[in-house]
């Protein structure tokens, strides 16, 4: 699998999309996991609804949400209030019994907020009563890693 890079701005939301063949993965739940090291396991962050028919319902784990368009074949992950520690390598997965097929490898890059030198009074934050659904989601910038690029820097 090639790795696709998604870039987001710190403090904003990042949407990651993972297209897949809807017929090939029919009836299967999906998951978003974080790769622990270059050859380490992929630690589950969030998975779609236990009932495949309800996969379109957004499920949250902390600041990460997942939703699946099972007919169109697009898994969408939203990382809310992106932070520098969210940067890293992830996978979109299709689950089948004890197996997990990789749909896409994703490298999340977090860019510094160009506004973070301003007073907090100039920034808008969703209030407690406001639904996050109505908040503006920044379009993510994505690209595939070039051959030879490595998602994990070599460790000394």
């Amino acid at each position: 699998h090639n790795t696709t890079v998604f870039q987001g701005v710190a403090g904003q939301s990042l949407q990651v999309s993972c297209p897949y063949d809807s017929m090939k993965h029919w009836g299967r739940r999906k998951a978003w996991c974080r790769q622990l090291g270059e050859k380490g396991p992929c630690q589950r962050v969030v998975s779609t609804h236990n009932l495949w028919l309800l996969s379109f319902l957004r499920r949250w784990n902390g600041s990460t949400a997942i939703t699946d368009d099972t007919l169109g074949g697009t898994l969408t992950i939203t990382l809310r209030n992106l932070q520098p520690h969210d940067a890293g390598l992830y996978q979109c997965q299709s689950l089948h019994g004890s197996e997990a097929d990789t749909l896409r490898k994703v490298l999340v890059e977090v860019l510094a907020d160009p506004l973070d030198h301003r007073d907090a009074g100039d920034l808008w934050f969703p209030g407690e009563s406001e639904s996050f659904e109505d908040a503006h989601v920044e379009h993510s910038i994505s690209r595939s890693l070039l051959e030879g690029e490595i998602p994990f820097p070599p460790t000394s």
């Epitope: 063949d21 017929m23 029919w26 009836g27 495949w52 089948h96 019994g97 004890s98 197996e99």
Partner: antibody, heavy 122, light 108 residues
């Protein structure tokens, strides 16, 4: 009509190679997994492996890994099961089956080929 | 690998009898289980999928139940056409997919 039609019976000698086929019709061949099943004379059903013709993703049962090769040619809606060197113990009926889908998200092997009898004898 | 243990291996019954066949999985397979009927010289025929859903065109005397590790196929009133061999199939995972050993239903 949705159907899978398999190639005819084969009689081979040990050590010979063989490729049997399973042609799908009446549905989008590239969009459904195709599995292969072995049934030795007087015995039960054994799973061999499965292929998704859309991208040729293939999974094998550990018992058959390295013993057979499963492939597909989507341009002619045909899946294949092949041996490079047959043994007498490969004598069996071989079935292909389509993994059908249901609106509930369920799947099942709903359509089966008529079977191909392979006899390996010196 | 998951093992599927089917019982009994042979069952003698009469027309009109209620027949129950059991399949046990060595670990949970949720409801990814199907039941097939096979007659001599013929390909298997799908009866039940998703543990309890009746395949289109299959008589309603056939029913399936169970989830997790224990599943049953029930024929409420055995008919002459039902004497055959029945197999359960676990397709919870593709490597491998596993059949039960089969149950031959014969005339008493």
């Amino acid at each position: 009509e949705v159907q899978l039609v398999q190639s005819g019976a084969e009689v081979k000698k040990p050590g010979e190679s063989l490729k049997i086929s399973c042609k799908g019709s009446g549905y989008s061949f590239t969009s459904y997994w195709i599995g292969w099943v072995r049934q030795m004379p007087g015995k039960g059903l054994e799973w061999m492996g499965i292929i998704y013709p859309g991208d040729s993703d293939t999974r094998y049962s550990p018992s058959f890994q390295g013993q057979v090769t499963i492939s597909a040619d989507k341009s002619i809606s045909t899946a294949y099961l092949q041996w490079s060197s047959l043994k007498a113990s490969d004598t069996a009926m071989y079935y292909c089956a389509r993994l059908g889908i249901y609106s509930t998200g369920a799947t099942a092997f709903d359509i089966w080929g008529q079977g191909t009898m392979v006899t390996v004898s010196s | 690998d998951i093992q599927m243990t089917q019982s009994p291996s042979t069952l003698s019954a009469s027309v009109g009898d209620r027949v129950t066949i059991t399949c046990r999985a060595s670990q949970s397979i949720s409801s990814w289980l199907a039941w097939y009927q096979q007659k001599p010289g013929k390909a298997p025929k799908l009866l039940i999928y998703d543990a309890s859903s009746l395949e289109s065109g299959v008589p309603s005397r056939f029913s399936g139940s169970g989830s997790g590790t224990e599943f049953t196929l029930t024929i409420s009133s055995l008919q002459p056409d039902d004497f055959a061999t029945y197999y359960c199939l676990d397709y919870n995972s593709y490597s491998p997919i596993t059949f039960g050993g089969g149950t031959k239903v014969e005339i008493k």
